[in-house]
Interface confidence: low
């Protein structure tokens, strides 16, 4: 592969737990500047697999509230704005990186931690098993 | 509001960027411990609304590799199996945080940022717009 | 039921200076981390400034540093935001919000208040 050189300007890594610490700035860069949130905001009431965003807040982590969903029905909503039983609202989930303050309650201390979270549903065709 | 007690063995924060500039583990902390990525992903095939992976990968991110999302067609997949151009497959977005090499090439040293990934697809019921 | 209404907004010409308010009702306000944020016409959703809840803490993001700064008063319950040396490129609605801004929902919005930097 392609090796990139060591940018001579990098702080010192003298830290005994390099490279496991590293420095991390939290003034957060928003590459999403061409995106309108709110373009995709009603989604979760316009969908055959309508959820609810649940809040899910923890002030030892960062960021301190994510956002949850919950699927409305187990079925799939139809044409004639019933529920179709025979397909099935499922979350779709993905995992995320977060901060973890740790030692716990320290301002500029966090560890990376992975979480799944739900980020919307989606209607399936279910998997049907066949009893002999 | 609740204010929670300093740790006192938190690290110093002497230095003068604090507390926008902390000290984070990348010894990841895994909380999905009891979840089974597996079952979730033939999602994107049963989908009434679709969607292909494609990989991203960037060197100078952590995570360097990131899934998108791109639905595979512009309405849902009908019980005949067919595309119904009446419903719209549209893509569930979120902002994660990711860590960007800042300077660039450093091992060390990253900058927060945040990007919008498409997770999957969804199908919704289109918003027509009437001319009068 | 929660209510955030700004004000301050107007035409201004480049240099000019704007303070903009947000008055909050409905919650404890002190106990909330608060958000300046705008829409420029035909763009996304930018955020602008944040403060913590007890006003120790204030972020920028890199575009208006040195030249907006946010405040708050918690026995008014008001968000402000004082811009100096607007440019053309700060024309937008900016809306205070109560909530995380990440992801992409916040709990709750005001209804926004028009700059526009213009000569």
């Known amino acids: 592969g392609i090796t990139i050189p060591r940018n001579p300007g990098c702080p010192n890594s003298e830290d005994k737990n390099f490279p496991r610490t590293v420095m991390v700035n939290l003034n957060i860069h928003n590459r999403n500047t061409n995106t309108n949130p709110k373009r995709s905001s009603d989604y979760y009431n316009r969908s055959t697999s309508p959820w609810n965003l649940h809040r899910n807040e923890d002030p030892e982590r960062y960021p301190s509230v994510i956002w949850e969903a919950k699927c409305r029905h187990l079925g799939c909503i139809n044409a004639d704005g019933n529920v179709d039983y025979h397909m099935n609202s499922v979350p779709i989930q993905q995992e995320i990186l977060v901060l973890r303050r740790e030692p716990p309650h320290c301002p500029n201390s966090f560890r990376l931690e992975k979480i799944l979270v739900s980020v919307g549903c989606t209607c399936v065709t279910p998997i049907v098993h066949h009893v002999a | 509001g609740i204010t929670i007690p300093r740790n006192p063995g938190c690290p110093n924060s002497e230095d003068k960027n604090f507390p926008r500039t902390v000290m984070v583990n990348l010894n990841i902390h895994n909380r999905n411990t009891n979840t089974n990525p597996k079952r979730s992903s033939d999602y994107y095939n049963r989908s009434t609304s679709p969607w292909n992976l494609h990989r991203n990968e960037d060197p100078e991110r952590y995570p360097s590799v990131i899934w998108e999302a791109k639905c595979r067609h512009l309405g849902c997949i009908n019980a005949d199996g067919n595309v119904d151009y009446h419903m719209n497959s549209v893509p569930i977005q979120q902002e994660i945080l990711v860590l960007r090499r800042e300077p660039p090439h450093c091992p060390n040293s990253f900058r927060l940022e945040k990007i919008l990934v498409s997770v999957g697809c969804t199908c919704v019921t289109p918003i027509v717009h009437h001319v009068a | 039921q929660v209510q955030l209404v700004e004000s301050g907004g107007g035409l201004v010409q480049p240099g000019g200076s704007l303070r903009l308010s947000c008055a909050a009702s409905?919650?404890?306000?002190?106990?909330?981390?608060m958000y300046w944020v705008r829409q420029a016409p035909g763009k996304g959703l930018e955020w602008v400034a944040k403060?913590?809840?007890?006003?120790?803490?204030?972020y920028y993001v890199d575009s208006v540093k040195g030249r907006f700064t946010i405040s708050r008063d918690n026995a008014k319950n008001s968000l402000y935001l004082q811009m100096n040396s607007l440019r053309a490129e700060d024309t937008a609605v900016y809306y205070c919000?109560?909530?995380?801004?990440?992801?992409?929902?916040?709990?709750?919005w005001g209804q926004g208040t028009l700059v526009t930097v213009s000569s």
């Open positions: 403060i913590e809840q007890d006003g120790s803490e204030e």
């Open positions: 919000a109560k909530g995380e801004i990440l992801p992409l929902y916040f709990d709750y």
């Open positions: 409905g919650f404890t306000f002190s106990s909330y981390g």
